[in-house]
């Protein structure tokens, strides 16, 4: 069976993991979304998508 991570679906350095129901993107700090496409904007943040100090990595997001 083809590797669902072969197409590199996770953006911004997110790590891809094959899963029985599809795949999972574990987002790098400062990103969120199914494919880590959204920069996290904490309240008061500037337009820069950099992660503020202490922001933990995003929870893995399902991508089905």
């Amino acid at each position: 069976r083809a590797d669902p991570c072969a197409a590199r679906p996770c953006a911004h350095g997110g790590r891809c993991y094959a899963h029985f129901s599809g795949l999972v993107c574990a987002c790098a700090p400062g990103y969120m979304g199914a494919r880590c496409e959204f920069p996290v904007h904490p309240d008061g943040a500037s337009a820069l998508p950099a992660a503020p100090p202490g922001l933990r990595p995003g929870d893995p997001q399902r991508y089905l």
């Epitope: 969120m32 979304g33 199914a34 496409e37 996290v40 904007h41 904490p42 995003g58 997001q61 399902r62």
Partner: antibody
Amino acid sequence: EVQLVQSGAEVKKPGASVKVSCKASGYTFTTYYIHWVRQAPGQGLEWMGIIDPSGGRTSYAQKFLGRVTMTRDTSTSTVYMELRSLRSEDTAVYYCARGGDGTWYYGMDVWGQGTTVTVSS
Amino acid sequence: DIVMTQSPSFLSASVGDRVTITCRASQGISNYLAWYQQKPGKAPKLLIYAASTLQSGVPSRFSGSGSGTEFTLTISSLQPEDFATYYCQQLNSYPLTFGGGTKVEIK
């Protein structure tokens, strides 16, 4: 029944703030992202941002950065969108919408009824 | 930002007509595209996601196709309840963006 119910219409003066609520029911609140989309009179749809109700993380469209805040209350399954420093061009219908299956890939499958915000002096 | 261009912006058709609406993306978005229907005074309704997958409960006369930069929404036989405005939306990258809309009116 899966639904999103929004707060009522608001009339605000320029410079003021507005806070719109969106109460979810009929599904597990923390499993699905919530988007906010607005529509000015006679105009198209404009994406404002997204909130992950599970962790409270947010991502806002660039044009709203610094002026919008999206929050959630998991105890009441409610999401809030506050827009500050209102101007006349913020007059619009504001919608909350659910991102399908905890992601945004599937589009926005459930929408609130909309909240009309009128900004006028 | 990815710009979504819909055409036509206005379409006059009769009941029973086959209607096609086109949406073009300013850069490739794979199949990350959704179509919505909106009637006056109402919230949009999701019709199609992933470019070609019909949302549950949507009549089979609606279909979507395309990948990359060019997409189409087709209504095989227009019904009275289909007169509305249709929007495409790209879900490929931040920020999410919509097309300008296509208003389908009765001829």
